[in-house]
Interface confidence: low
């Protein structure tokens, strides 16, 4: 009833709780002396369904037959309307429309751990929309019975709070769940099980790993389990992998040796348990153990390359470069690199440990036969040394690769192609493609990149450390025994017209011609590989087209003579630079007049 229904009553027949599709009769009646003050026949009783008026009647009572009510709760309110006054609430009722419970399905019981309690779950079926009680019953040997009730609208889980023990693991238990509401009841099919069927062990705990003699090949995993566990499954993977390695073990008694772990790798380990070979279920996976395996001595060999630079008549500079070993080859933290330099005829040798760098530069005599060996060392030992005989890599002209070209290949890639050398191509043992940013000063500090290519290849895609709008000096070496030939080319992955022209810094007169000197365009303004410079000149104050001279770009060149100027005429000169994408804007303008009249 609503607010104690002091003025009247609302009755509902056959019941406040009805089956979907049923009809109800609602009666609203006034209590004595609760009608309109003056004239009871003026009583107007109005029935509302929620806030919508559905019926009215003059008098002391109102009857209404209602059909088609939806699932759930519908509120009916009866009000009294008297002349010259607001409607007064008399009483109300809620009608609950629902269905009888369906048969609960898939009843399943589990006991988590040997010390846990039995809990069961089931599927309720469709919502009854009514208050529904579920009763779970468990019967066991010796007529033992347990019962638990649940009054939760969404009840599909109950814990008996009892613990099954392994004293008689083959004893049968039967569970059944019954759903009851105002419209009916329904019971599940019984579920029969034994202790071994429903006990799900707790996940293993206290997992640890030991490496005998700090060796990855002698590794044992330890853990603790509940007492009755018979089977375990182990899974493990490198922390950066998504794929698990899986191992099943029987009667492990809390330990297992692992034989296939990689050195210096962080692994994740998990373990699960089961009580019986074919009964029951696996435990949840244990919490993860994360552990790093010990180092082993490096495998593989360093990829080493070198550069020679002439210093003077007696000395040369050797720069060695090498690439880091892969993680799987390093098998630990590389502590240092050992470089040995040896003069092969005199036997003189020098060894140096390099830390924090993958390059080394030294000066050696130009005479003698020199060799280097480079190896990488971690806490367990060193890799096999890579040995290289120092030779003049470009000495053998007949070994020089032919028709070398460099073309942009997508974003930040350059495709280098070549033809085998004229000399017997089968003599080539390997090609090395080397590239570095082009710096007009020939800066030896610029990082060197290289890749090795098999002797039957005539192309290589270079992508490492390639930036857009930067020009690279690319060399292709053909190596054969102690001989080498090379060819070079300039290339870029992306280019546009240079941002500025060269700056003329001096004009000097020599025997009736002039020599123009300029400063190189800053690398960041070249916007790719320069192909040409242009020198423009015209008579001052003249409107005629300027004359020009085009000079092929050479890295080291920064001056050029012009001998077509007339004496005693003042000229204006300027320069531009060109890439394959176009010409730069003008550089600075300079005036000059032959015979000492330059400004």
């Amino acid at each position: 009833k609503i607010d104690a229904c002091k003025r009247g009553d609302v009755t509902v027949k056959p019941s406040h709780v009805i089956l979907l599709g049923s009809t109800v009769n609602i009666t609203c009646s006034l209590k004595p002396r609760q009608g309109c003050f003056h004239y009871s026949r003026r009583n107007k009783l109005i029935l509302y369904k929620f806030d919508r008026r559905i019926n009215f009647h003059h008098g002391h009572s109102l009857n209404s037959q209602v059909t088609g009510l939806p699932l759930g709760t519908t509120l009916f309110v009866c009000k009294l309307a008297c002349i010259n006054s607001d409607e007064i609430q008399i009483c109300g009722a809620e009608i609950f429309v629902g269905v009888a419970p369906e048969q609960p399905q898939n009843l399943s019981c589990i006991q988590k751990g040997e010390q846990g309690t039995v809990a069961c779950t089931w599927e309720r079926g469709r919502d009854t929309h009514l208050y529904t009680e579920y009763t779970l019953q468990l019967s066991g040997p010796k007529n033992l019975t347990w019962q638990k009730q649940c009054k939760d609208i969404y009840c599909d889980y109950l814990d008996f709070g009892i613990n099954l023990t392994p004293e008689s693991p083959e004893s049968n238990f039967t569970a059944k769940v019954t759903a009851v509401n105002s419209l009916g009841s329904s019971s599940s099919l019984p579920s029969t099980f034994t202790f071994l069927d429903i006990v799900r062990p707790l996940p293993p705990w206290d997992i640890r790993i030991k490496f005998q003699k700090a060796s990855v090949s002698r590794c044992t995993l330890y853990w603790r389990d509940e007492g009755l566990v018979l089977l375990n499954r182990l899974r493990y993977r490198p922390s950066n992998s998504r794929l698990w390695n899986m191992v099943n073990v029987t009667k492990a008694k809390g330990r297992h040796d692992l034989l296939d772990l990689k050195p210096f790798t962080e692994y994740e380990f998990q373990i699960s348990s089961k009580l019986h070979l074919y009964k029951g279920s696996w435990s949840d996976w244990s919490e993860s153990l994360r552990a790093q395996t010990p180092e082993e001595e490096p495998t593989g060999m360093l990829d080493v390359w070198y550069m020679k630079r002439h210093i003077d008549y007696s000395r040369q500079q050797i720069s060695l470069f090498w690439k880091n070993l892969s993680v799987s080859e390093a098998r630990g933290k590389i502590l240092h690199y050992q470089v040995t330099l040896q003069e092969l005829t005199g036997g003189k040798a020098m060894t140096q440990n390099i830390t924090g760098h993958t390059s080394w530069t030294t000066v050696i005599p130009r005479t003698g036969n020199w060799a280097v060996a480079v190896s990488a060392a971690n806490s367990k030992g060193s890799s096999l040394p890579t040995r290289i005989n120092i030779m003049n890599l470009c000495e053998a002209g007949l070994l020089a690769p032919r028709q070398v070209s460099a073309n942009s290949e997508g974003m930040d890639n350059i495709l280098v192609t070549w033809q085998p050398p004229r000399k017997d191509p089968s003599a080539v043992q390997e090609y090395v493609v080397e590239w570095r940013e082009l710096h007009p000063g020939g800066d030896t500090q610029v990082p060197l990149n290289w890749l090795r290519s098999r002797p039957y290849n005539v192309s290589a895609l270079i992508s490492e450390n390639i930036k857009s709008y930067i020009c690279y000096e690319i060399r292709v070496y053909a190596l054969s025994g102690d001989q080498g030939g090379c060819s070079s080319i300039l290339g870029n992955s992306k280019h546009k017209a240079p941002l500025s022209g060269p700056h003329i810094n001096a004009i000097t007169e020599e025997k009736g011609s002039i020599l123009i000197s300029w400063n190189s365009i800053p690398v960041q303004e070249q916007m790719g590989c320069l192909l040409h410079y242009r020198i423009y000149w015209k008579e001052r104050d003249s409107n005629s087209q300027p004359q020009l001279c085009e000079i092929p770009y050479r890295v080291s060149q920064n001056s050029h003579p012009i001998n077509s100027l007339q004496p005693r005429v003042t000229y204006v000169l300027w320069m531009t630079a060109l890439t394959a994408a176009g010409e730069s804007s003008h550089g600075n303008e300079r005036e000059f007049c032959l015979q000492g009249k330059a400004n």
Epitope: I2, V17, Y131, S182
Partner: nanobody, 123 residues
Framework: QVQLVESGGGLVQAGNSLRLSCAAS????????VGWFRQAPGKEREFVGR????????YYADSVKGRFTISRDNAKNTVYLQMNSLKPEDTAVYYC????????????????WGQGTQVTVSS
């Protein structure tokens, strides 16, 4: 067994809003219908509104209809009373109440009650 604790009351100016919360303990709170009531000084306890267990059905007293809204978050075991356009006559202690037998007719006969929270609306 369910314990109810109201919060969110306080002093507010007429025309402003306030949100009361009714927090419940107990795993099966989502099975309960929850009602809000209020009691002004010297007056009887008055029904404000109520919400069904699922939140699908609400019902309000005429005096608050259109201004007050009841909602619930069963995951948080909490029912809310959002009060907008407050008037001085809304000043009262507000109680929430819960009942498991949600098929009974709506009345003041709720089984579980909170201690109440004071709401004062000044003009």
């Amino acid at each position: 067994q369910v314990q109810l604790v109201e919060s969110g009351g306080g002093l507010v100016q007429a025309g402003n809003s306030l949100r009361l919360s009714c927090a419940a303990s107990g795993r099966t709170f989502s099975s309960y219908v929850v009602g809000w009531f209020r009691q002004a000084p010297g007056k009887e306890r008055e029904f404000v509104g109520r919400i069904s267990w699922s939140g699908a059905r609400t019902y309000y007293a005429d005096s608050v209809k259109g201004r007050f809204t009841i909602s619930r978050d069963n995951a948080k075991n909490t029912v809310y009373l959002q009060m907008n356009s407050l008037k001085p006559e809304d000043t009262a202690v507000y109680y929430c109440a819960a009942d498991l037998k949600w098929e009974v007719l709506l009345s003041e006969h709720f089984e579980y009650w909170g201690q109440g929270t004071q709401v004062t609306v000044s003009s």
